[in-house]
């Protein structure tokens, strides 16, 4: 039997081609030159190597480039990127948006892996800022990426990127992030008609101010309770009972089940009890009839 470290006669790879898919792992190790592999990386993705075979090719590249791969190799990694560890990726210096796109394409349609997260981090740090082109690329591949950014970083997100965002992508956004994203969404969807606009803007409403909620209440939108419960408390408090009734439409009955939770609880405390009674839901905790409500913040502003 041939010594496993020696390449069998006639099997030395002259180029990276499909004949190599029928090589055993030890044959790949023995018969493929690392420098040849590096110069023909663009061919690897077109060849259906198994992931075990890709491990062998990765090992060859690791030996050739112990300090990290050059971008000319990184750009053509293709499925070999899936075999990289975050530690491998931290050695890279990725500056080209085309390289980033090529690697994100490999993982397209799947959750952001630790490799991808590390790659994005390396790329953004290398660029020094989150420019429009980078954000367009990242939100196109990972709309949920928005919620991993700070409000300061989000301020540079172009409204055009908002179109790619799905409701579930905002699940992890906190109110401070939605405060930044909402005006962008409002701008992005401004030319849509009422019902279509509401469908698109709905998941961003956690950043909406009172005046926008008042405006929506005039448009028969029938907001569901789940959306209502995610609204900013300070934006809900000034709404009248009539406005909330119009905003929720048939879903207004759901207020009863949520009367002990924010923002419903705090909103109830601000309403006159007779106004709440008009809903016929048995909501309790409003301001009793005959009591005078002083708005101390207004009084302070006047003095």
């Amino acid at each position: 039997e041939v010594e496993k470290t020696a390449c069998p006669s006639g099997k030395k790879a002259r180029e990276i081609d499909e004949s190599l898919i029928f090589y055993k792992k030890w044959e790949l190790e023995a018969c493929v030159d690392a420098a040849l592999l590096a110069t023909q990386m663009d061919r690897v993705n077109a060849i259906p190597f198994t992931y075990e075979q890709l491990d062998v090719l990765k090992h060859k590249l690791d030996e050739l480039y112990p300090q990290g791969y050059p971008e000319s190799v990184i750009q053509h990694l293709g499925y070999l990127f899936l075999k990289m560890s975050p530690e491998d990726i931290r050695k890279w210096n990725v500056t080209s948006l085309e390289t980033l796109k090529a690697l994100l394409e490999v993982n397209k349609g799947h959750e952001m892996s630790p490799q991808v997260a590390t790659l994005i981090d390396r790329f953004v740090k290398g660029r020094g800022q989150l420019d429009k082109d980078t954000l367009d690329t990242l939100t196109a591949f990972y709309p949920g990426y928005l919620c991993s950014l700070s409000p300061e970083e989000l301020s540079s997100v172009p409204p055009s990127s908002i179109w790619a965002v799905r409701p579930q992508d905002l699940d992890t956004c906190d109110p401070r992030q939605l405060d930044v994203l909402y005006p962008k969404a409002r701008l992005a969807f401004q030319n849509m008609n009422g019902s279509e606009y509401f469908v698109k803007i709905q998941s961003f409403l956690g950043g909406a101010p009172t005046e926008d909620l008042k405006a929506l209440s005039q448009q028969n939108v029938s907001m569901d309770l789940a959306t209502f419960m995610k609204l900013r408390t300070d934006a809900v408090l000034p709404l009248t009972v009539a406005e909330v009734q119009k905003l929720l439409g048939p879903h207004v009955e759901g207020l009863k089940a949520e009367e002990r939770h924010r923002p419903v609880r705090d909103w109830i405390l601000r309403q006159r009890q007779d106004d709440l009674d008009t809903l016929g839901l048995g909501l309790q905790g409003g301001i009793p009839n005959g009591y005078l409500v002083l708005d101390l913040s207004m009084q302070e502003a006047l003095s």
Epitope: P48, Y51, Y79, V106, G109, S113
Partner: nanobody
């Protein structure tokens, strides 16, 4: 996860034909490539054929005799084996790998015996 189940193996005379099937289920949308791999008695694994997108590949030993195909609507991989020889006797395994998880999946195998 992807589950693979092979069928169609059996005993056949030299020169005869068999058609193997491999039914895939689970996260089939993420499959990147599918393969037929065989293991003859007392030997190691040998790649037989691969289908990758619309491209097909064959080991020299089966070229011109075996045909790999895939029916995406049925999530099934096939191997049509003609002009069978005694040296084709082996357990034939279906293999698939997926994008995202970068994992290989294997079926349980189906035995093909070529004997007169």
């Amino acid at each position: 996860q992807v589950q693979l189940v092979e069928s169609g193996g059996g005993v056949v005379q030299p020169g005869g034909s068999l058609r193997l099937s491999c039914a895939a289920s689970g996260s089939t949308f993420s499959i990147r490539a599918m393969r037929w791999v065989r293991q003859a008695p007392g030997k190691g694994l040998e790649w037989v054929s691969v289908i990758y997108g619309s491209s097909t590949y064959y080991a020299d030993a089966v070229k011109g005799r075996f045909t790999i195909s895939r029916d995406n609507s049925k999530n099934t991989l096939y191997l049509q084996m003609n002009s069978l020889r005694a040296e084709d006797t082996a357990v034939y395994y279906c293999n698939a790998d997926t994008i995202g998880t970068a994992r290989d999946y294997w079926g349980q195998g189906t035995l093909v015996t070529v004997s007169s």
